[in-house]
């Protein structure tokens, strides 16, 4: 007599999550009578996934009319496949008794499933940074399987080399995770500069997933201030101009102070953007020499962003060379500069 | 090739919780069982139980009430936990991988952590 | 619970000369697939235990030939056909039938 054969032809099968998997399996007799079940595993933990004689098994249904006479094809369909239904699947032939005795296994099928990475979510830095500092971004994705998988960053179109990537779990698993970091080295010309994490998968045939991320969100770009006189004009009133450019973002409050005293302040609101997406924003002081006795000491204070204040201070000389006229510049941008502008009456 | 590799205290005090881990390494967690076994100092082997990788768990019913595995496939590493432990629990605690592909039986322990040393005392 | 029963429980042996150690199983371990789930380990003196052989006659990977097994049911053989100074430790025979999983009280082999 013939030896039962279990035949699953397949060592393994692979199936897009959401799609449907066939396990096949056959005998090679129809004696002795005795029904087939299906198991996930082996060993005492193994699970019942289908029992073709009796249960209620939702997602499971036999290819073939398992109570057709003479069927020697015992494969299964399983519908609407997640991760989860990864595993080493076994067609078992039982004997008929009570209870049915296990006869032979199948040399069992791994499912294997194919499930797409969810889009990249890159996120930067808590705080800005300014220009010529180093920030991190972070880009996540989850739920692929298999676990092989490409991350690329890109600046500018740019791909970036100062990246680390984990994938984890480190063994096998039913789905895996992404994350990875990217360095990025800010310029003052970052504001329109975008970062993006590419992920390539076998699931998104070709066709890679991006997350971008703005520097505009995590970049602070410093003003520069320069203060200038405009002439004197007829009526003994000095025009002087505090000049704040090249900053980024658009917050910035800026108060001119007469000998320690707030004169005036004042909050940048709807400035047109330079081209690098940087703003610029001029204010004036006019000052009446006439008014004063002694010399008096502007400063022009600018809070940009939250960040310590930038003075620059000027003094205004009210008695001496009243002809004497000019331009001063302070051009730093940090800390107190002071400058002389002399004026009085002729 | 897979690699076991048991952590945790040497020195465990009388009717404390004893505590070890096992790492594995170079292999997969899947469709093997994990299994822990203890040698008492000059004495043969004793099965304390095992873990299937899909969670389910089987002890050795002489031990079964102070005994807990778990396992965390996410990093690939399996726990012993023994509790009210006694002078009788002092032993040499190995992890290992249990093979299975024929039915309701079991095809060998076919991977084996060095074993790490258990001393109850106070 | 199966209860497992070597014999001897010390072999002195001669290098070159083949040796044989028992076990016996308190009920059978064959399997109704035809399986005997019964596992034969050896463990070298400071090592942790090594699988020889598993279902009864199938050597393990890496295992040299010239250990074998046999048995069916509850009777149950491990035959080294010519012994090496490397085969002295402790071998044990374990079932793995059903939980929870037992050992025999092992079989000392040593040189002469």
């Known amino acids: 007599e013939e030896e039962l054969q279990v035949i699953q032809p397949e060592k393994s099968v692979s199936v897009a999550a959401g799609d449907s998997a066939t396990l096949n399996c056959t005998v090679s007799s129809l004696i002795p009578v005795g029904p087939i079940q299906w198991f996930r595993g082996a060993g005492p933990g193994r699970e019942l996934i289908y029992n073709l004689k009796e249960g209620h098994f939702p997602r499971v249904t036999a290819v073939s009319d398992p109570t057709k006479r003479n069927n020697m094809d015992f494969s299964i369909r399983i519908s609407n496949i997640t991760p989860a239904d990864a595993g080493t699947y076994y067609c078992v032939k039982f004997r008929k008794g009570s209870p049915d005795v296990e006869l032979k296994s199948g040399a069992g099928t791994e499912l294997s499933v194919r499930a797409k990475p969810s889009a990249p979510v890159v996120s930067g830095p808590a705080v800005r940074a300014t220009a010529e500092h180093t920030v991190s971004f972070t880009c996540e994705s989850h739920g692929f399987s298999p676990r092989d998988i490409t991350l690329k960053w890109f600046k500018n179109g740019n791909e970036l080399s100062d990246v680390q990537t984990n994938v984890d779990p480190a063994g096998k698993s039913v789905s895996y995770s992404i994350r990875s970091t990217a360095r990025v080295l800010l310029t003052r010309r970052d504001v329109h500069s975008q970062v993006i994490c590419e992920v390539a998968h076998v699931t998104l045939q070709g066709d890679p997933l991006r997350g971008t991320a703005n520097l505009s969100e995590a970049i602070r770009v410093p003003p520069f201030l320069e203060v200038t006189q405009q002439s004197m004009r007829a009526d003994n009133q000095v025009n002087v101009t505090c000049q704040v450019t090249k900053f980024y973002p658009q917050r910035l409050q800026l108060t001119w102070l007469e000998n320690g005293n707030v004169s005036r302040t004042e909050m940048a609101s709807a400035l047109p953007e330079n081209k690098d997406g940087t703003y610029n924003w001029t204010s004036w002081l006019l000052v009446n020499v006439s008014a004063h006795r002694d010399d008096v000491k502007l400063t022009c204070q600018v809070e940009h962003d939250g960040q310590p204040a930038v003075n620059k201070s000027f003094s205004v000389k009210v008695s001496a060379h009243p002809k004497e006229q000019g331009s001063n510049t302070a051009a730093e941008n940090t800390g107190t500069n002071e400058r002389n502008i002399y004026g009085g009456s002729g | 090739q897979v690699q076991l590799q048991e952590s945790g205290p040497g020195l465990v005090r009388p009717s404390e919780t004893l505590s070890l881990t096992c790492t594995v390494s170079g292999g997969s967690i899947r469709n093997y069982y994990w299994s822990w076994i203890r040698q008492p100092p000059g004495k043969g082997l004793e099965w304390i139980g095992f873990i299937y990788y899909n969670g389910r768990t089987f002890y050795n019913p002489s031990l079964k009430s102070r005994v807990t595995i778990s396992l965390d496939m996410s990093i690939n590493q399996f726990s012993l936990k023994m509790t009210s432990v006694t002078a009788a629990d002092t032993a040499v605690y190995y992890c290992?991988?249990?093979?299975?592909?024929?039915?309701?039986?079991?095809?060998?322990?076919?991977?084996w952590g060095q074993g790490t040393t258990v001393t109850v005392s106070s | 619970d199966i209860v497992m029963t070597q014999s001897p429980l010390s072999l002195p042996v001669t290098p070159g000369e083949p040796a044989s150690i028992s076990c016996k199983s308190s009920?059978?371990?064959?399997?109704?697939?035809?399986?005997?789930?019964l596992d034969w380990y050896l463990q070298r003196p400071g090592q942790s235990p090594q699988l020889l052989i598993y279902?009864?006659?199938n050597r393990a990977s890496g295992v040299p030939d010239r250990f074998s097994g046999s048995g069916s049911g509850t009777d149950f053989t491990l035959k080294i056909s010519r012994v090496e100074a490397e085969d002295v430790g402790v071998f044990y025979c374990m079932q793995a039938l059903q939980t929870p999983l037992t050992f025999g009280g092992g079989t000392k082999v040593e040189i002469k």
């Open positions: 290992a991988r249990v093979r299975a592909y024929s039915g309701i039986g079991l095809d060998g322990t076919d991977v």
């Open positions: 279902q009864g006659s």
């Open positions: 009920q059978s371990l064959l399997y109704s697939n035809g399986y005997a789930y």
